[in-house]
């Protein structure tokens, strides 16, 4: 099982939309896939996919989840608020036929406030 996540870095303005994509691939077929999005280590949602459908479409505050066959799991945040800023990780596990799990690399989301004066030292506070 392979999970690739993108983008690595996403900078959006407050009130706009942010899209995080997780590509889940496995050489053999799977019957049920458990997926999970976390933000700063806290679980936003943990639905599963079976028969081509997600068991849940909501993922955290203002988060919508979608699955596009063959391999794309998308988390869409709309509208984005300042507290959406953080480190997002996508995780996946094939539950059936046999357990195999993997996770993506971090997507760092930066949300710029509508009021630019609130933006002081933002980049400096997130090194790397």
């Amino acid at each position: 099982l392979s999970v690739q996540q993108g983008p690595n870095l996403l900078q959006v303005r407050q009130g706009s939309q942010a899209t995080l994509v997780c590509q889940v691939d496995q050489a053999t077929a799977w019957e049920r896939l458990r997926v999970k999005w976390t933000k700063d280590g806290a679980i936003l949602c943990q639905p599963y996919i079976t028969n081509g459908s997600l068991s849940l479409g909501v993922c955290g505050p203002q988060g919508r989840l979608s699955w596009q066959a063959p391999s794309h799991l998308t988390l869409q945040l709309d509208p984005v608020s300042l507290n959406h800023s953080g480190a997002y990780v996508c995780w996946a596990a094939v539950e059936i036929p046999e357990l195999e799990e993997a996770e993506g690399n971090i997507t760092r989301l930066f949300v710029d406030p509508d009021d630019p004066t609130q933006n002081r030292n933002r980049i400096a506070s997130f090194p790397g």
């Epitope: 496995q26 050489a27 053999t28 077929a29 028969n51 081509g52 063959p70």
Partner: antibody, heavy 120, light 113 residues
Framework: QITLKESGPTLVKPTQTLTLTCTVS??????????WNWIRQPPGKKLEWLAL???????SYNPSLKSRLTITKDTSKNQVVLTMTNMDPVDTATYYC????????????WGQGTLVTVSS | DIVMTQSPDSLAVSLGERATINCLSS????????????LNWYQQKPGQSPKLLIY???TRLSGVPDRFSGSGSGTDFTLTISSLQAEDVADYFC?????????FGDGTRLEIK
């Protein structure tokens, strides 16, 4: 460019253990999302998948031969090793190693194969 | 195990004519989750290793001549060579990767009539 090369004995006696090595060049076997496989083909017959080892170290075997097979990898040498116990003349075949990726599921790169004859 | 049954065992076709090889699987190779068929076709010339031609039942590998095409879904699959060339003389195998153990068809030997 990825190349795979099988090596091992060309002749083994019945009941002996066969050890085959697949040396991978141009690509690291530690790269995530790849499976390293052994496949064999008796003369004039069909291909038969034997075993695989995944990046994580997880293994899978053909149930019909599982009790006789062990697949391992030596990352320091970039090699995948197959051992097959209790060899029999019906195990005479060309043995191939091949890779397979999660993004795909097909055998993309194959070694040239090594013919192993089992005879006393 | 998924059993792959190929037909015919051998096939003789005139140069420039169409060659059709069939592959039947003992269970569906289509996944409703990924909307893919887990079926590949390989060509093996005498003394050589197999080479991938078609993956996911109908996608031609880059560099494979467009006279080769794959079709089918579920349990019934076909490899078609629209206009046989001399270099197409080989054995052809289907292979499923829906589940392990990964299994191959018995092969079809293609010759020139």
């Amino acid at each position: 460019q990825i190349t795979l090369k099988e090596s091992g004995p060309t002749l083994v006696k019945p009941t002996q253990t066969l050890t085959l090595t697949c040396t991978v060049s141009g690509f690291s076997i530690t790269t995530g999302g790849y499976y390293w496989n052994w496949i064999r083909q008796p003369p004039g017959k069909k291909l038969e998948w034997l075993a695989l080892i995944y990046t994580s170290g997880r293994t899978s075997y053909n149930p019909s031969l599982k009790s006789r097979l062990t697949i391992t990898k030596d990352t320091s040498k970039n090699q995948v090793v197959l051992t097959m116990t209790n060899m029999d003349p019906v195990d005479t075949a060309t043995y191939y190693c091949a890779d397979m990726a999660d993004k795909g599921g097909w055998f993309a790169y194959w070694g040239q194969g090594t013919l192993v004859t089992v005879s006393s | 195990d998924i059993v792959m049954t190929q037909s015919p065992d051998s096939l003789a076709v005139s140069l420039g004519e169409r060659a059709t090889i069939n592959c039947l699987s003992s269970q569906s190779l289509f996944s409703s989750n990924t909307k893919r068929n887990y079926l590949n076709w390989y060509q093996q010339k005498p003394g050589q290793s197999p080479k991938l031609l078609i993956y996911h039942a109908s996608t031609r590998l880059s560099g494979v001549p467009d006279r080769f095409s794959g079709s089918g879904s579920g349990t019934d699959f076909t490899l078609t060579i629209s206009s046989l060339q001399a270099e197409d003389v080989a054995d052809y195998f289907c292979q499923q990767h829906y589940e392990t153990p990964l299994t191959f068809g018995d092969g079809t030997r293609l010759e020139i009539k």
